[in-house]
């Protein structure tokens, strides 16, 4: 009982339970397909315990197998100007270091305005995850429509 209480007082990071839940801050200009994220208690249901944000991209601090999840809803779904047509694609991948660059998730909106997915994947300390949204006009920043997170599952 005493051990359980002591364990509860330790920060999640020290137990290896790295976790992050982020909300959308902004997109890049047209030629930059990345989504830029923000997180922290001041924003509400958003937090970082272990991983950190580097210029809006999520950087992993502990090796392990992670559950990566994402949902993106488009604010402009049917474009009146069709300046950037569907198919709109969302890709989540390791974008740095370059030696580990790989796509982890790729989704298409097709006729829908929202996509969501998750997968288990090994990640290493120093891996930076990028979320690229191509072909669309604007994703929603509403916190129950667009969010991105990782959860450490096991070594």
């Amino acid at each position: 009982q005493r051990f359980a209480q002591a364990q509860q007082q330790l920060p999640l990071e020290s137990l290896g339970w790295d976790v992050a839940e982020l909300q959308l801050n902004h997109t890049g200009p047209q030629q930059d397909p990345r989504l830029y994220w923000q997180g922290g208690p001041a924003l509400g249901r958003s937090f970082l315990h272990g991983p950190e944000l580097d210029k809006g991209q999520l950087r992993i601090h502990r090796d392990g197998i992670y559950m990566v999840h994402i949902q993106v809803t488009l604010a402009i779904c049917s474009s009146t100007t069709a300046s950037r047509h569907h198919p709109t694609t969302l890709a989540v991948g390791i974008c740095s270091p370059a030696s580990r660059s790989i796509s982890l998730l790729r989704l298409s909106f097709h006729q829908g305005c929202t996509i969501a997915s998750q997968r288990l994947t090994p990640l290493a300390r120093g891996d930076t995850l990028c979320t690229n949204l191509t072909g669309t006009l604007l994703p929603s920043r509403n916190t129950d429509e667009t969010f991105f997170g990782v959860q450490w599952v096991r070594p």
């Epitope: 902004h26 047209q30 604010a75 049917s78 300046s83 305005c113 929603s140």
Partner: antibody
């Protein structure tokens, strides 16, 4: 044929409130972002507010934040603009338009509804 | 917040070409802005003409003749509306709207240019 029709304009005293409506037809309303733009007498256009297709994301011009609220009822194909604490400088023709104005043009406009704020 | 300016008026002859400018004066680079153009005739609501970010990202309204085209002039830090083969019915007020791409900040309309076809 795409149509948007504003209503709800009128004369209101400074500090008063008014709710504008915009009825849409001829397109799938619940998949399009919508906007409000205004034009003061003899002046240029001023973007007021926009709302995403779902209503989840709203945008406002800085000078209207906190006083104006944009909303939509997708079941009724209707866009709204609730205007509170009105000032004389809010006197304008208010247009409803299809599109967001952010990263895309406003392709279809209504005829506008006149809002006059005067004592 | 972006600030954009238009020359208040412009005159040109039928059949000639005219270049309307939408100059960004807030210190930002026009290259990072989405520009939309609108035409408004007296007593009528605005009419959407075209959208331009780059040659890869542009759109022309279906009812708008190809005489109207959009571009940017990086050296002048301006969005451009080019009208060739000017016709009397082109006489109107023209407005640009500028949105800083990806910023989620409110788009800003320029004050408008009144085009007179002599």
């Amino acid at each position: 044929e795409v149509q948007v029709q504003e209503s709800g304009g009128g004369l209101v005293h400074p500090g008063g409130s008014l709710k504008l409506s915009c009825a849409a037809s001829g397109f799938t309303f619940d998949t399009y972002a919508m906007s409000w733009v205004r034009q003061a007498p003899g002046k240029g256009l001023e973007w007021v507010s926009a709302i995403s297709w779902s209503g989840g994301e709203t945008f406002y011009a800085e000078s209207m934040k906190g006083r104006f609220t944009i909303s939509r009822n997708n079941a009724k194909n209707t866009l709204y603009l609730q205007m509170n604490s009105l000032k004389s400088e809010d006197t304008a023709v208010y247009y409803c338009a299809r599109g967001m104005g952010l990263a895309e043009g406003l392709t279809d406009w209504g005829q506008g509804t006149q809002v006059t704020v005067s004592s | 917040q972006a600030v954009v300016t238009h020359p208040p008026s412009l005159s040109a002859s039928p059949g000639s070409s005219v270049r309307l400018t939408c100059t960004l004066i807030s210190g930002d680079n026009i290259g990072g802005y989405d520009i939309s153009w609108y035409q408004q005739k007296t007593g009528s609501p605005p009419r959407y003409l075209l959208y331009y970010y780059s040659d890869s990202y542009k759109h022309q309204s279906s009812g708008v003749p190809s005489r109207f085209s959009g571009s940017k002039d990086a050296s002048a830090n301006a969005g451009l509306l080019l009208i060739s083969g000017l016709q009397s019915e082109d006489e109107a007020d023209y407005y640009c709207s500028a949105y800083k791409s990806g910023s989620y900040k409110a788009p800003v309309f320029g004050g408008g240019t009144h085009l007179t076809v002599l």
